[in-house]
């Protein structure tokens, strides 16, 4: 069976127009919340960590990467029942033995503090109240997201030097 | 932990962002190529397999789905050094003992022929010539892709299927 | 083709057991959450288990709960609903059906024919 | 378990009538609902997710509105075709619920 892709209607962060002016902002798609200056998807149905990571890939956006506490404050208030969990895009590097975002930046010992193991598949979630890790192979919702920005002229290459 | 369903944690349609009339054609990103109804990045540097899938997933976008040979050929086409080899959204899964794609369909038999060990940890690359599975842990460069298709109006979850 | 294929349904007696398959075909089964819901002869819908796209989390209707169990094969691209203590109540044609999303429970925008289950003695 | 409550549970009507059948949920749901329609022997089809996104394939006359407890499912012109069973579905929690449905029948 092929990859059956279904066509991405619209890039919200990087494509830039051809021909026509392009509006200054886009809208979120059905089923995300707009926040700030990000698209979120809560997902209802639950994944492990690598699937969860798959499934935002594969609608062309991201687990969710938290920059700050305001943002982790933002985002867990959106959370309205305690006993809900959401993976977020943050997991243990064995090898640099330090908790590492999915755009390979490593977290800052002044940002989330989190509860649990920094062990061999360990990943992040959230909650209303607190960040915690868990066994990557645990079944649990997800937050993806989808910068929501004005068109930058120049798109920083960084990770292709 | 066996994760709750709880209540719904967002509304799927409050906070929607007003928007002015979309363009017709987006186009590809600066640093990627339109190839076909896709933007492809070749990356640069190199990365194990699932740092090349986080990497496509921040740059929301996907490691690289191949639909078809004729497919295959256009992307090889692309690669002009024999000896550079690029890691595709592949991998066996050891548990369904298939190859799959990342967006969770498996590899038909009429697709591409796989050189090299379907066991754990095998994940699948493409050089100018041949496609062969290698140690995911493996450093190898990556491509991603993001789809390219008209904008409709209504942004329609169509494409998140 | 993008369907679903319900089959083994038939008539058994209160007590008994059947397990139902559901075959799905044109889509990527193993990104879906999927669903079984039935409807007894001339009454509505009612939904009757769930279990998420790897596997690993189910749910299912009080109704069932304890009787039923929900299983998956991705590689076979198969939705199993194994139904043991069955009761005259359980009669019903069953679905199966998948969300529009693949982050979502429900929302199904793909459903079986059914197949038809009657429980009797 | 959240219930949904459909009312009419059916409607008498002729082509190109405009009809309006809602539902109404034990407790808040946000936009998370779905409508169905029915029709003998056959399985349900989806017309409208998120409360009022119209589904691919579903013709126009059909549309959705609502948010919180109340919902609506309208046909604006109904047409031969549209004269069927339909039932809205919650999809904020588990367990998924389904309205007692309305059956739309011909004048």
């Known amino acids: 069976q092929k990859p059956s892709i279904g066509k991405c209607s619209v890039d919200i962060q990087q494509n830039r127009t051809k021909t026509t002016e392009r509006p200054d902002l886009l809208n979120c798609p059905i089923y995300w919340q707009q926040v700030q200056e990000k698209c979120l998807l809560f997902s209802h149905t639950v994944n492990p960590w690598n699937n969860s990571l798959a499934d935002c890939s594969t609608k062309e956006s991201s687990l969710l990467l938290i920059q700050d506490k305001d943002e982790l404050t933002r985002t867990q208030n959106l959370i309205h029942d305690k006993a809900i969990s959401f993976w977020i895009g943050l997991n243990f590097s064995l090898s640099e033995k330090n908790w590492k975002w999915i755009n390979g930046s490593f977290l800052s010992s002044n940002d989330l503090k989190i509860t649990g193991d920094a062990k061999e598949n360990s990943c992040v979630y959230i909650s209303q109240t607190s960040v915690y890790s868990e066994y990557c192979s645990t079944e649990m919702k997800w937050i993806c997201q989808k910068e929501l920005t004005l068109v930058r002229n120049k798109v920083s290459p960084d990770s292709w030097l | 932990q066996k994760p709750s369903i709880g209540k719904c944690s967002v509304d799927i349609q409050q906070n929607r962002t007003k928007t002015t009339e979309r363009p017709d054609l987006l186009n590809c990103p600066i640093y990627w190529q339109q190839v076909q109804e896709k933007c492809l990045l070749f990356s640069h540097t190199v990365n194990p397999w699932n740092n090349s899938l986080a990497d496509c997933s921040t740059k929301e976008s996907s490691l690289l789905l191949i639909q078809d040979k004729d497919e295959l050929t256009r992307t090889q086409n692309l690669i002009h050094d024999k000896a550079i080899s690029f890691w595709i959204g592949l991998n066996f899964s050891l548990s369904e003992k298939n190859w799959k794609w990342i967006n969770g369909s498996f590899l038909s038999s009429n697709d591409l022929k796989i050189t090299g060990d379907a066991k754990e940890n095998s994940c699948v690359y493409i050089s100018q010539t041949s496609v062969y599975s290698e140690y995911c842990s493996t450093e190898m460069k990556w491509i991603c892709q993001k789809e390219l298709t008209l904008v409709r109006n209504k942004v329609s979850p169509d494409s998140w299927l | 083709e993008v369907q679903l294929l319900e089959s083994g349904g038939g008539l058994v007696q209160p007590g008994g057991s059947l397990r139902l398959s559901c075959a799905a075909s044109g889509f990527t089964f193993s990104q879906y959450a999927m669903s079984w819901v039935r409807q007894a002869p001339g009454k509505g819908l009612e939904w009757v288990s769930a279990?998420?796209?790897?596997?690993?989390?189910?749910y299912y209707a009080d109704s069932v709960k304890g009787r039923f169990t929900i299983s998956r094969d991705n590689s076979k691209n198969t939705l199993y609903l194994q139904m043991n203590s069955l009761r005259a109540e359980d009669t019903a044609v069953y679905y199966c059906?998948?969300?529009?999303?693949?982050?979502?429970?429900?929302?199904?925008?793909?459903w079986g024919r059914g197949t038809l289950v009657t429980v009797s003695s | 378990d959240i219930q949904l409550t459909q009312s009419p549970s059916s409607v008498s009507a002729s082509v190109g009538d405009r009809v309006t059948i809602t539902c109404r949920a034990s407790q808040g749901i946000y936009s998370w609902l779905a409508w169905y329609q029915q029709k003998p022997g056959k399985a349900p089809k989806l017309l409208i997710y998120?409360?009022?996104s119209l589904q691919s394939g579903v013709p126009s006359r059909f549309s959705g509105s609502g948010s919180g407890t109340d919902f609506t499912l309208t046909i604006s012109s109904l047409q031969p075709e549209d004269f069927a069973t339909y039932y809205c579905q919650q999809a904020s929690d588990l367990p998924i619920t389904f309205g007692g449905g309305t059956k739309v029948e011909i004048k």
């Open positions: 998120a409360a009022s």
């Open positions: 279990i998420s796209a790897a596997g690993g989390t189910t």
């Open positions: 059906a998948k969300p529009l999303d693949s982050s979502q429970w429900a929302d199904f925008d793909l």
